[in-house]
């Protein structure tokens, strides 16, 4: 990796846990998004692989509420509204960073956690395994 | 209100920026995900709304690499491989938290940032606006 020169204006971290523990400014900066972005609109209803959104809530985590997508069908919805089981609805997953208080109940000490969330669904051609 | 005793096991934050600046442990805990999860497999190729993954790299950000989905077509791919322009390929977007070095180049000082990323694409029925 590239060695970053120690900037004299940087906070000092001669902590025994450094560099595992860093200082983080919690005043969130919004990049490329308005304060109140429209979240993927109504795609969950209009998609050929529609999904439902389920609330995953944990008050000890930030964000406390995460909406998880669950595909409605095994197959994909055709133009006539029927489900085509020759195709598959599958979840698109992404790893996201969340904050968790650690030690618990400490007001100003946190740990980053990575969780895998389903964001929506897409329609794919199935992988067919031929038996010899 | 009930006074919460300051937990002796909590880090001390007599920092002039406290309490906007807090300590965060970067030794990331993976919850419900392996260290190297398969990223939504090869769905980007097999989807009826296929997408390309573009590498968005920024050494001042954590994670420094984020993969952005760009839908390949305006329409959706039919079983015969042709594109159906009566349907739309659209990106599924999600807001995620990242850490940005602040001040720049400081190895142990960050700011929380919210960015909007495209995770994949899904095929939707278009909204048709009828002109009176």
């Amino acid at each position: 990796g590239i060695a970053i020169p120690r900037n004299s204006g940087c906070p000092n971290s001669e902590d025994k846990n450094f560099p595992r523990t860093v200082m983080v400014n919690l005043n969130i900066h919004n990049r490329n998004t308005s304060t109140n972005p429209k979240r993927s609109s109504d795609y969950y209803n209009r998609s050929t692989s529609p999904w439902n959104l389920h609330r995953n809530e944990d008050p000890e985590r930030y964000p406390s509420v995460i909406w998880e997508a669950k595909c409605r069908h095994l197959g994909c919805v055709k133009a006539d509204g029927n489900v085509d089981y020759h195709m598959n609805s599958v979840p698109i997953q992404q790893e996201i960073l969340v904050l968790r208080r650690e030690p618990r109940h400490c007001p100003n000490s946190f740990r980053l956690e990575k969780i895998l969330v389903s964001v929506g669904c897409t329609c794919v051609t199935p992988i067919v395994h031929h038996v010899a | 209100g009930i006074a919460i005793p300051r937990n002796s096991g909590c880090p001390n934050s007599e920092d002039k920026n406290f309490p906007r600046t807090v300590m965060v442990n970067l030794n990331i805990h993976n919850r419900n995900t392996s260290t190297n999860p398969k990223r939504s497999s090869d769905y980007y190729n097999r989807s009826t709304s296929p997408w390309n993954l573009h590498r968005n790299e920024d050494p001042e950000r954590y994670p420094s690499v984020i993969w952005e989905a760009k839908c390949r077509h305006l329409g959706c791919v039919k079983a015969d491989g042709n594109v159906d322009y009566h349907m739309n390929s659209v990106p599924i977007q999600q807001e995620i938290l990242v850490l940005r070095r602040e001040p720049r180049h400081c190895p142990n000082s960050f700011r929380l940032e919210k960015i909007l990323v495209s995770v994949g694409c899904t095929c939707v029925t278009p909204i048709v606006h009828h002109v009176a």
């Epitope: 609109s41 944990d58 964000p63 406390s64 995460i66 208080r101 | 919460i4």
Partner: antibody, heavy 124, light 109 residues
Framework: QVQLQQSGPGLVKPSQTLSLTCAIS??????????WGWIRQSPGRGLEWLGR?????????DYAVSVKSRITINPDTSKNQFSLQLNSVTPEDTAVYYC??????????????WGQGTLVTVSS | DIVLTQSPATLSLSPGERATLSCRAS???????LAWYQQKPGQAPRLLIY???NRATGVPARFSGSGSGTDFTLTISSLEPEDFATYYC??????????FGQGTKVEIK
């Protein structure tokens, strides 16, 4: 811009049902980035959150524990409005009732738009 | 439920003075979900600060918020005549818990 217009009776008899409506303009009750709530204010109780509805592929309801057994908040998508029903009211339910839009972007939660308020008196 | 306790109940100050309002939670809350509102007699509350420290659209720079954990502060750097009102803090912890403080009235001395 977004506006909320409240309507409903200002006087309700004890044991009856309090019904208020909040009409939305400039946004949709089915918005996936907002929740729609009711808050009341009385001299004795101060500001008290009563409940909210939000749409995320289906309707979600959250109600304050203090009124959970008596409250219903319903959307009306055809009229782009939502309503509050509070059953079995008593004089303690006398208050100014506000409807409000709650920005619900995962990362923040706050009421940015409020209705004008409706004073509801419970009295025989 | 989490209890939010605001202090002082009343703050008597003159225009131009600095006002410091406190909001204390009965247990740790996420600063991101803490907001401050201003209310004048006969009016609905108006959003001032969200996420503990972010000014809402159109709110003058003399208003600032800070805090984390259990202790939060709203500061008005130099009081203007239109700032004399009642201020409320509120927090969202988890469904169905959304609570308001009892308010701090800022009155002209």
């Amino acid at each position: 811009q977004v506006q909320l217009q409240q309507s409903g009776p200002g006087l309700v008899k004890p044991s009856q049902t309090l019904s208020l409506t909040c009409a939305i303009s400039g946004d949709s009750v089915s918005s996936s980035s907002a929740a729609w709530g009711w808050i009341r204010q009385s001299p004795g109780r101060g500001l008290e959150w009563l409940g909210r509805i939000s749409y995320r592929s289906k309707w979600y309801n959250d109600y304050a524990v203090s009124v959970k057994s008596r409250i219903t908040i319903n959307p009306d998508t055809s009229k782009n409005q939502f309503s509050l029903q509070l059953n079995s009211v008593t004089p303690e339910d006398t208050a100014v009732y506000y409807c409000a839009r709650e920005v619900d972007s995962l990362y923040y939660s706050y009421f940015d738009i409020w209705g004008q308020g409706t004073l509801v008196t419970v009295s025989s | 439920d989490i209890v939010l306790t605001q202090s002082p109940a009343t703050l008597s100050l003159s225009p131009g003075e600095r006002a410091t309002l406190s909001c204390r939670a009965s247990q740790n809350v996420w600063a991101f979900y803490l907001a401050w509102y201003q209310q004048k007699p006969g009016q609905a509350p108006r959003l001032l600060i969200y996420g503990a420290s972010n000014r809402a659209t159109g709110v003058p720079a003399r208003f600032s918020g800070s805090g984390s954990g259990t202790d939060f502060t709203l500061t008005i750097s130099s009081l203007e005549p239109e700032d004399f009102a009642t201020y409320y803090c509120t927090q969202y912890y988890s469904s169905p818990s959304l609570t308001f403080g009892q308010g701090t009235k800022v009155e002209i001395k």
